[in-house]
Amino acid sequence: GSERTCCPVNWVEHERSCYWFSRSGKAWADADNYCRLEDAHLVVVTSWEEQKFVQHHIGPVNTWMGLHDQNGPWKWVDGTDYETGFKNWRPEQPDDWYGHGLGGGEDCAHFTDDGRWNDDVCQRPYRWVCETELDKASQEPPLL
């Protein structure tokens, strides 16, 4: 079948999800497409525990996550509800800053060097994290 019961090579398993950490950079949309071609998505952070796990693996480096407001409201790429979900923004962020001189504001979220989140220009070539969930079918305990 098409069920994913274990993580692909070079991916890290954690709490029934698989994570892949880039060591090179891409613009947010290109990173998003890369993850999609891996049958995954940019990482969606749903808890403080998951935040700590990702932060441990990426270190103090700007890294894209699967959160953006390119169409207005902030949205997670997998449909997780933003308003009621976990957030870890830096103080006074997101600010949709226009002063960078690159045109437009800031529509894509990334982990900063201390792990807290900032919104930034989506074209910046940051590292990224892909995530894919292990199939629910494979999470059922075996029948005895």
Epitope: S2, R4, G25, K26, N33, L37, D39
Partner: antibody
Framework: EVQLLESGGGLVQPGGSLRLSCAAS????????MSWVRQAPGKGLEWVSV????????FYADSVKGRFTISRDNSKNTLYLQMNSLRAEDTAVYYC??????????????WGQGTMVTVSS | DIQMTQSPSSLSASVGDRVNITCRAS??????LIWYQQKPGKAPRLLIY???SLQSGVPSRFSASGSGTDFTLTISSLQPEDFASYYC?????????FGPGTKVDIK
């Protein structure tokens, strides 16, 4: 030996349809994204489309968007390209290719021998 | 879309020559650049990925360098089997565009 074998090419009239197949062997097909690339006679290579390993994501060149559909059947280790509303400029050798990703760097490492599609009245 | 250009479009060289082929991207593609070799009537063959990494089984006379927008493929000592066309391709962004190719023929 890892192998890709295309089939389904031929002569078709403008506006017609054709379905290309690419049979994969000797690798775990569902673990790899797959792509179609074409080459018009005497011309260079043109990327056409790509599909993820489990088929959940697909992408297309603007020149074929809305007319071509990439799909796969992992139970049959086969990649497909459904081509509708064909035009003379779609005349080319069509190659399927396996995508690899090494530390975030993508490349196409295994290619089929190609199948010729001719669109002419 | 990212446009890729190559120069020269063709070149004539002799066995033993050192050959350089240049590929340029219309915007930065960092190091997401591939080189292929193609012989008439055959499928492309992967030579180089990630701008400078040699694909397994490719002779060490092939090397490549570059980052950002400018890239070079070098054949240190041209062999008879190297007469072919060479294409670059960027995988920074979809669509994964190719350069127009460089044909290397016998002088």
């Amino acid at each position: 030996e890892v192998q890709l074998l295309e089939s389904g090419g031929g002569l078709v009239q403008p506006g017609g349809s054709l379905r290309l197949s690419c049979a994969a062997s000797r690798f775990t097909f569902s673990s790899y994204a797959m792509s179609w690339v074409r080459q018009a006679p005497g011309k260079g290579l043109e990327w056409v489309s790509v599909i993820s390993g489990r088929g959940g994501s697909t992408f297309y060149a603007d020149s074929v968007k809305g007319r071509f559909t990439i799909s796969r059947d992992n139970s049959k280790n086969t990649l497909y390209l459904q081509m509708n509303s064909l035009r003379a400029e779609d005349t080319a050798v069509y190659y399927c290719a396996r995508r690899i990703a090494v530390a975030g760097n993508e490349a196409f490492d295994i290619w089929g021998q190609g199948t010729m599609v001719t669109v002419s009245s | 879309d990212i446009q890729m250009t190559q120069s020269p479009s063709s070149l004539s060289a002799s066995v033993g020559d050192r050959v350089n082929i240049t590929c340029r991207a219309s915007q930065s593609i960092i190091s997401y650049l591939i080189w292929y070799q193609q012989k008439p009537g055959k499928a492309p063959r992967l030579l180089i990925y990630a701008a400078s990494s040699l694909q397994s089984g490719v002779p060490s006379r092939f090397s490549a360098s570059g980052s950002g927008t400018d890239f070079t493929l070098t054949i240190s000592s041209l062999q008879p089997e190297d007469f072919a066309s060479y294409y670059c391709q960027q995988t920074n962004s979809i669509p994964f565009t190719f350069g127009p190719g460089t044909k290397v023929d016998i002088k």
